[in-house]
Each structure stands twice: as structure tokens, then as C-alpha cells.
């Protein structure tokens, strides 16, 4: 049997393999061992077999998708029926009070491969034996205690295929230079040591992607937008673009990249090499976003230029014409660098919203029957923009981090925005105070600290009889700059 | 739809070089090889080679090496097929057709450019 | 380079009737060969790939088999619209290779 019988349901072309050469993988037309690599076709009885315990999954994922060029790296990891676990000298073993359908093992392991490698019969001198090769005969890799390796896994795409000796999670990276674009197909087949030979325990498929548009994605974040994912912002306050670029294997850390925005509302284009840019809607209305990424990525030479044609009189034969009879393009040159680009289009709509909430004011409410340790505090609050429709507070500690209260309720506001919010204060101390304004599209925030001392009854009684003058020493309120803008505030005497 | 549409007939002197072209659309251009095909008159199908759009290699036949050149342009999603140092022989309607990613075989094909090499 | 040996070179055969055309590979193509119906003046169509699937839109009388070096096309019961002359193309390696064609005619 070939490699491509084993591992694909069809021989694949010299063409596939010719226009998608992988460094360091072999042709599937080698041949396979299948006297030490058994084949077992799906649905054969002997799956059932194949594992003490029940199945075992092997989980294929990659980080496709894939700029041409760069490395893809593919990951396989193992997962066991319940209860086993690879312990570190790479043999299967039952966890430590774990039940399963066969109850608690007296036995601790599943496989014990120790004491199969101690038996070094029919090795020779180099410490190699006839069964320590892979499926093609390629004798295993002799890295640092590679005797606890017990499974092989055989990685196939594209006509060609990659051995590797390992435990129960491997990986390997495949440089993506020569790869057709498009959807590609990675399959794996795992085997397990079994004496002087290997058994098939498991077999995946996965598809990835390789490209030649550098994957683009774009956060979109605004202050005071209720719903950063719903594409809806708000008039007159900057959004920020977060470009983020998949580049898994940093193929792109030395290029150079430029970032063309175009906002769709009539601003022109804007070309940054900042990956993070703010910008302004001054309209309501949709608009349609386009970024264009460029990135001077590592790639493959022009072809040299044709040479002049011959002259019509014979010349002497230059030896066989055999060497390279197809023409293929030189090898790229590492020094070669090629442009490519990546695109973001998004529609956003702008609508109105809370802006900007100032609390301008804070008055401590007297109390002809105060509790004898709650306070009632007025906070009088403007905004800027749409007009709210909720409006929520938040108490905690001084260091806003421990909430002690949160109350939301419906307001009413005319079209100046002003309104009084009144909240209690259990006990003296020193509070943080959290504001929030809100409609169906916007959340607009302001925090304060404010400290609320001591009072005895007969002092409150007293200030309450007074008729008020002054109440408002007893309390200070200190603003948090939040958001990076300024907000007044006022005592008031 | 996937189309590809090749410039118009030309007429030659042997020595002189034609520059054929095939605009592409309704696809990813940069995905697929386009290949360049030819049929001489009453004759069969003979494939000359391929050009990768997404990074400009080539694969010529060995009959056209040093006579063929391949070339692309991204921007206007344009191969393009040079032949020099024409012949009568060459008298041919030219090809290009789109592989179907790893598989040569072609789905599509542009409707043909007739070469005339005549002195 | 592979040689692609198609046979016969013309065929005619009654509407209705079974039309069989034979391609010979000079080594092992399998599975990668393809069929072509070209009519006067206009491009190739393809038929079939990969030795045995049909293209999209083909009419189903139309069918492939073979493997290793010998190929077939079945048109199960021909039609005036099949005549045309076809071709079969290993999509193996390259050079890309074609047979010389097969006029299909009716009787």
C-alpha cells in the first residue's frame, strides 16, 4: 500500500503536489508498512478493540486562517475515555479516585509502555530496532526521552504527508509559501505502541484556509454606547477602530502597515500606520466604513525577464534540456517582499445619545424624623444630548470596586435635562457614587466620593430646626475624573 | 458568474510578438492558475503553461520556454500570454482557461483569440 | 511527458444508440483525467473530472470510468446536440497533456 491508500479516499495529483510543496514533507506515493502500521478500513470490528476502555478522540485544530507565506500551525491533542490520563513517563494511567462504568481500577494502569521499551531485544548497537521506525521506515528522531513517546501521528494534506513521534498533544507548523489559496483539507491518523508494532486509535480531519488577504478584524468602541456589537453609535462623540491583524506566526512584525480608512460620511480618506484611530460622526444616518490594509509581506521574486529572442541562425546546444523543463519560477528570494492587503467593511448607524452627565449639585436633605443613621442626599444632575429615560446609581466603597447598592428607575426629564436624584446613605463615611444616564442606545457615566460624617440625633434635630442654613458643611463631595473629561461641580453653601 | 474575456484577434509577422490578454471576473482572481490553451486550425488542444495570479510564478511546457511569458495584473484582475519570435506554426486560437484550485482541470474558459502569423 | 493515445478518431452512431470513446495514458494517471466536448467555434466544455465525476449542469447519459492508464467515455444515448468533437485530458502532472480528439457524428 502507498501512503495516499492509507491516509485519502483518492491518489492525489503530481500537479497538487508539484503547486503545493510543504518543507520537510514527503510524496504520499511512498510506500506505507502496513505489517507495523495495520490498516483498518471505517466500520471495521477491530476499532472496538483498538483502545482499553472505550474510544479515544483525537481533536485536530489549527490557527487558519493563514496570509500565504506565513506558518500555520496545527495542534493535535488526545482526549481519553474517563478516568485515564497520560502520566510523565507517557504511559496511560487510571486517575486517582475517578469511577467509571468499570468502577475503581485495582490496576493503576491502562498502558504500561515502561516496561515494554525496557525490553530491548533485537535492537542494535545504535540503540535503533526494526519497530522503532515510522510508518514509511524512517527510524524515529532519538530526542531526550523520546522512549516515552508512544503514539504516531501521521499528518496528510495536499499529497504529501508529515511523521511525527509524540504524547498526547502534538504540533506542527507548516510554512504556507508554496500552498494553493483557498480551503484545504488536514487529515490525521493516530497510532499507539502495541508491543513490537503500532495499533490505529483515532482519525481526524480538519479544514483550513490559506489566503492571500491579511485577515482584518475591527473593534469598534465608544463612550456611552449602551451596545458596542450592535453597529450603533452615537453623534458627536469619537469612536475608536481597533485594527486587529490574525498573524499567529508574526509573519508581519517586520512589514511595514498602513491602515486607509474611508468613514463613508464625505471626510475623505485618512491613512495611519497606528492601528488604533478615533473618529467623529457629526450626522445621524448610516454610513458605510472601509478599511484596506496594506503590509509589505516576505514573498516570492517577479520572474527575471524574458531573455531576447534567439537569432534565427542555430547556436550550440547547451547539454540536456532536461533539468528544468517546465520553467518553474526560482525559489523566492527571502529578500523579495510582495504587497499584500486585508479589507474591513462595516455599516454603522450614528443616532443621537447621552453625551455628557455633570452632577452640579449635592444637597443633604433634612429629615424632621432622621433615622439615626441614614442620610438623604440630593444629587442634581444635568446632561448633554438625547434625553434620558432611566437613570442609575451605583454606591460602593471609596474605592468604587465593592458595590453596596445599585438602584435603576424611569425618570422624566424635560428638554433641558435637569433632574434631582435622591438617594440614601446608610451610615457615616466615605462613599463612591456611580451615575448613570440612559436611553435605548447610549449609558452615560459620572462617579463622585462623597463623605458623610457623624450626626447625632439632637444635632440633626437641631440643624432640621434651624430652618437649614448651612446643611450642607457637613458633607464634601469630591469628583473623579472619569473617561479622561473634566465635569463642574459645585459646593454649595 | 465567473467569466473571462480575452482581447480581440490579431494579425502578425513572423519574428514580431503578439500580447494576448484575459480579463477575469465574478471570482476570487488571485485563487485560481489561469493556464493558456491553444488549437492550431482542424487541429487538437495543446497546453503552453499557467500563472499563478496571488504571486506571479509560472510553469511553462517545455515546446514554449524562452518563447512564452506570462504576466498579471492584479488591479485590473488581467493575465496576460507574450509570444516572440512568431511562425507561421503559431497560427492559432489561443486559450485561457482557470484551473479548479489543486485540480487542472478547466470549468472555465475565455471564448478565444485568434493569433494570424502571416507575412 | 505523458502521451494521451484517444480512439477511435471519428465515430458515428444512430440517435438514441451508445457512443464509447477510449483514452490510453503512456503511464498511471488515475484518477485525474478529465473530458471535453468542444462544438465549431467555441471553447472547450468540461464534462467530466477526476476520471468519473460529472461537471455541473452535464447531462447525466454523459459518464466516465477507468483507472491506471485506460479511460472511457459513455454517452449512453446520444443526441444531436452531442456532436462535437472530444477530448481527454490527464490533469496529473505537467506538462498538462491532451489526446488528439474524437469526432462523434451521427449515422
Known amino acids: 500500500k502507498r501512503f495516499h491508500d492509507v491516509l485519502g479516499n483518492e491518489r492525489p495529483s503530481a500537479y497538487m503536489r508539484e503547486h503545493n510543496q510543504l518543507n520537510g514533507w514527503s510524496s504520499d506515493e511512498n510506500d506505507w508498512n502496513e505489517k507495523l502500521y495495520p490498516v483498518w478500513k471505517r466500520g471495521d470490528m477491530r476499532w472496538k478493540n483498538s483502545w482499553k476502555g472505550g474510544r479515544v478522540q483525537a481533536v485536530l485544530t489549527s490557527d487558519s486562517p493563514a496570509l500565504v507565506g506565513s506558518n500555520i500551525t496545527f495542534v493535535v491533542n488526545l482526549v481519553f475515555p474517563r478516568c485515564q490520563k497520560e502520566d510523565a513517563n507517557g504511559n496511560i494511567v487510571y486517575e486517582k479516585n475517578c469511577r467509571n462504568e468499570a468502577g475503581l481500577s485495582a490496576d493503576p494502569y491502562v498502558y504500561n509502555w515502561t516496561a515494554w521499551s525496557e525490553d530491548s531485544d533485537g535492537e542494535n548497537g545504535t540503540g535503533q530496532s526494526h519497530h522503532n521506525v515510522f510508518p514509511d521506515g524512517k527510524p524515529f528522531p532519538h530526542h531526550p526521552g523520546w522512549r516515552r513517546w508512544n503514539f504516531v501521528y501521521v499528518f496528510h494534506t495536499l499529497g504529501q504527508y508529515f511523521q511525527k513521534l509524540g504524547r498526547c498533544s502534538v504540533r506542527v507548523s507548516v510554512n504556507t509559501a508554496n500552498v494553493t489559496l483557498g480551503p484545504q483539507l488536514m487529515e490525521v491518523t493516530v497510532y499507539r505502541r502495541h508491543g513490537r508494532a503500532y495499533v490505529p486509535i483515532a482519525q481526524v480531519k480538519d479544514v483550513y484556509v490559506v489566503t492571500d488577504q491579511i485577515p482584518v478584524f475591527v473593534t469598534m468602541s465608544q463612550k456611552n454606547d449602551r451596545n458596542s456589537s450592535d453597529e450603533t453609535f452615537l453623534k458627536d462623540l469619537p469612536i475608536t477602530f481597533d485594527v486587529l491583524i490574525h498573524d499567529p506566526s508574526h509573519f508581519l512584525n517586520y512589514s511595514t502597515i498602513n491602515y486607509k480608512w474611508s468613514f463613508g460620511d464625505n471626510t475623505g480618506l485618512f491613512v495611519s500606520i497606528n492601528h488604533t484611530v478615533n473618529h467623529t460622526y457629526v450626522l445621524n444616518g448610516t454610513f458605510s466604513l472601509n478599511l484596506t490594509v496594506k503590509a509589505a509581506a516576505p514573498g516570492p521574486c517577479p520572474p527575471p525577464p524574458p531573455p531576447p529572442p534567439r537569432p534565427p541562425k542555430p547556436t550550440p546546444s547547451l547539454g540536456p534540456a532536461g533539468d528544468n523543463p517546465l520553467g518553474l519560477s526560482e525559489i523566492p528570494d527571502e529578500n523579495c517582499q510582495i504587497n499584500r492587503y486585508g479589507h474591513f467593511q462595516a455599516t454603522i448607524t450614528i443616532v443621537e445619545g447621552i453625551l455628557e452627565v455633570n452632577i452640579i449639585q449635592t444637597t443633604d436633605v433634612l429629615m424632621l424624623v432622621p433615622g439615626p443613621d441614614s442620610s438623604l442626599i440630593d444629587f442634581v444632575v444635568t446632561c448633554q444630548g438625547s434625553i434620558p429615560t432611566e437613570v442609575c446609581t451605583i454606591i460602593s466603597d471609596p474605592t468604587c470596586e465593592i458595590t453596596q447598592n445599585a438602584v435603576c428607575s424611569p425618570v422624566d426629564v424635560d428638554e433641558m435635562c435637569l433632574l434631582t436624584v435622591r438617594r440614601a446613605f446608610n451610615g457615616s463615611g466615605t462613599y463612591c457614587v456611580n451615575l448613570t444616564l440612559g436611553d435605548d442606545t447610549s449609558l452615560a457615566l459620572t462617579s463622585t466620593l462623597i463623605s458623610v460624617p457623624d450626626r447625632d440625633p439632637a444635632s440633626s434635630l437641631r440643624m432640621a430646626n434651624s430652618g437649614g442654613g448651612g446643611l450642607n458643611d457637613i458633607f464634601e463631595a469630591q469628583k473623579i475624573e472619569w473617561h479622561e473629561h473634566h465635569h463642574h461641580h459645585h459646593h454649595h453653601h | 458568474q465567473v467569466q473571462l474575456v480575452q482581447s480581440g484577434a490579431e494579425v502578425k509577422k513572423p519574428g514580431a510578438s503578439v500580447k494576448v490578454s484575459c480579463k477575469a471576473s465574478?471570482?476570487?482572481?488571485?485563487?485560481?492558475?489561469m493556464h493558456w490553451v491553444r488549437q492550431a486550425p482542424g487541429q487538437g488542444l495543446e497546453w503552453m503553461g499557467e500563472?499563478?495570479?496571488?504571486?506571479?510564478?509560472?510553469n511553462y511546457a517545455q515546446k514554449f520556454q524562452g518563447r512564452v511569458t506570462m504576466t498579471v495584473d492584479k488591479s485590473t484582475s488581467t493575465v496576460y500570454m507574450e509570444l516572440s519570435s512568431l511562425r507561421s506554426e503559431d497560427t492559432a486560437v489561443y486559450y485561457c482557461?482557470?484551473?479548479?484550485?489543486?485540480?487542472?482541470?478547466?470549468?472555465?474558459w475565455g471564448q478565444g483569440t485568434l493569433v494570424t502569423v502571416s507575412s | 511527458d505523458i502521451v494521451m493515445t484517444q480512439s477511435p478518431d471519428s465515430l458515428a452512431v444512430s440517435l438514441g444508440e451508445r457512443a464509447t470513446i477510449n483514452c490510453k495514458a503512456s503511464?498511471?494517471?488515475?484518477?485525474?483525467l478529465a473530458w471535453y466536448q468542444q462544438k465549431p467555434g467555441q471553447p472547450p466544455k468540461l464534462l467530466i473530472y477526476?476520471?468519473?465525476y460529472r461537471y455541473t449542469g452535464v447531462p447525466d447519459r454523459f459518464s466516465g470510468s477507468g483507472s491506471g492508464t485506460d479511460f472511457t467515455l459513455t454517452i449512453s444515448s446520444l443526441q444531436a446536440e452531442d456532436v462535437a468533437v472530444y477530448y481527454c485530458?490527464?490533469?496529473?502532472?505537467?506538462?498538462?497533456?491532451f489526446g488528439g480528439g474524437t469526432k462523434v457524428e451521427i449515422k
Open positions: 503511464q498511471d494517471v488515475s484518477p485525474s
Open positions: 477526476s476520471a468519473s
Open positions: 465574478g471570482y476570487t482572481f488571485t485563487s485560481y492558475w
Open positions: 500563472i499563478n495570479p496571488s504571486d506571479g510564478r509560472t
Open positions: 482557461a482557470r484551473s479548479g484550485g489543486n485540480y487542472a482541470w478547466f470549468a472555465y
Open positions: 485530458q490527464q490533469h496529473y502532472s505537467i506538462p498538462l497533456t
